[in-house]
């Protein structure tokens, strides 16, 4: 009955997510059969997070709303390795909103999940950010510098990247 109660718990947890994510892709974590980590299908996974590339073009505020409806946020990039993983799924001729903004226009950049902004772990293109009116960040490709960040007006529709914690069942 330990296995039975574990299954019941899993089912109720899955029901929680069903509203937004009718299908999950789960993998066994480690050697313990009881620990599964899941991402919504067709999200991709890296370390403890799931990622979704939204190809609809929307403003930053709408993009963040769109992610939150799915139980996620616009992506917060914490490491170079994470960015390297993310860019594998991006198109070079597109730009994608990040969960990074400067609402006050004072160059106090902030992440949507309140992760402290660390100047040492930023990947701005050279010369960026360059406009106080451009209060939202995108990631895009420049032939001279490959992938990096740029500040743009928040109201310019772009594609976006959503990120959520993996679902453990």
């Amino acid at each position: 009955n330990f296995m039975y109660s574990k299954t019941v718990k899993r089912l109720s947890k899955l029901r929680e997510y069903q509203q937004y994510h009718p299908s999950l892709t789960c993998v066994m974590e480690g050697k313990d059969i009881e620990d599964w980590s899941c991402c919504p299908t067709p999200w991709t996974s890296f370390q403890s997070s799931c990622y979704f590339i939204s190809t609809g073009m929307q403003s930053w505020t709408k993009s963040q709303k769109n992610c939150s409806v799915m139980g996620a946020d616009l992506v917060v990039i914490n490491t170079r390795e994470e960015q390297d993983f993310i860019i594998q799924n991006l198109k070079r001729n597109s730009s994608y909103f990040l969960g990074l903004s400067d609402p006050g226009g004072r160059r106090h950049w902030q992440w949507v999940d309140q992760t402290p902004y660390n100047e040492n772990v930023t990947f701005w293109h050279s010369g960026e950010p360059n406009n106080l009116d451009e209060r939202c960040a995108i990631i895009n490709f420049r032939s001279s510098e490959e992938w990096g960040w740029n500040d743009i007006h928040c109201h310019v529709p772009q594609k976006s990247i959503c990120k959520m914690k993996k679902i453990y069942i």
């Epitope: 963040q64 709303k65 226009g105 360059n130 451009e134 007006h153 529709p157």
Partner: antibody, heavy 121, light 111 residues
């Protein structure tokens, strides 16, 4: 006093070109995103183009994309709108307007008096 | 594009009474409690003039008889009490997503 003064309007034939200018004074021009907005003879307002303060990022609606080019000279405190392949439906009063940003929202807080463009054969 | 529908297209209000103008967006234009809707007044031969920004904030120098309200896709401009000098055309404008769009305008006549 914050001021925007447009010039360069006039009568032009369909298919022709025209360059509008907007002289700004009383504020740090390079710090502001600037727009051109037009008003049709039926009094409808339509945004035409905007340009960021530095770096020259430009944006246009589909109706003018490829025909109109917005530019600025921050040293001269001047905004420009180069219009080509003009059509009769481009006939309007053209206003230069300043964007003001506050958090994620923005608005046009300063407008020029406008310059009239008439496209007719 | 976000379409803004203003109503009525014109209205006549007696001096001292209330004028109410509605602006409906084809989709929500707010975020985090802020409505991305602005209101402008235009008198003949003049450019538009900012009255209200972010749905309910009065631009400096604008009389307190002007007020804005609303959220989501429904916004309202109120003028009370209406004065002679308020005869003009009023426009709403959304700044949530490009392209920025304007309502068709409401012409206010003072009776």
């Amino acid at each position: 006093e914050v001021k925007l003064v447009e010039s360069g309007g006039g009568l032009v034939k369909p298919g022709g070109s025209l360059k509008l200018s907007c002289a700004a004074s009383g504020f740090t021009f390079s710090s502001y995103t600037m727009s051109w907005v037009r008003q049709t003879p039926e009094k409808r307002l339509e945004w035409v183009a905007y340009i960021s303060g530095v770096g020259g990022d430009t944006y246009y609606p589909d109706s003018v994309k490829g025909r109109f080019t917005i530019s600025r000279d921050n040293a001269r405190n001047t905004l420009y709108l180069q219009m080509s392949s003009l059509r009769s439906e481009d006939t309007a009063m053209f206003y230069c307007a300043r964007h003001h940003y506050s958090h994620y929202f923005w608005y046009f807080d300063v407008w020029g008096a406008g310059t009239t463009v008439t496209v007719s054969s | 594009d976000i379409v803004l529908t203003q109503s009525p297209a014109s209205l006549a209000v007696s001096l001292g009474q209330r004028a109410t103008i509605s602006c409906k967006a084809s989709q929500s234009v707010d975020y985090d409690g802020d409505g991305f809707m602005n209101w402008y007044q235009q008198k003949p031969g003049q450019p538009p003039k900012l009255l209200i920004y972010a749905a309910s904030n009065l631009e400096s120098g604008i009389p307190a008889r002007f007020s804005g309200s609303g959220s989501g896709a429904d916004f309202t401009l109120n003028i009370h009490p209406v004065e002679e000098e308020d005869a003009a055309t009023y426009y709403c404008q959304q700044s949530n997503e490009d392209p920025p769009t304007f309502g068709g305008g409401t012409k206010l006549e003072i009776k």
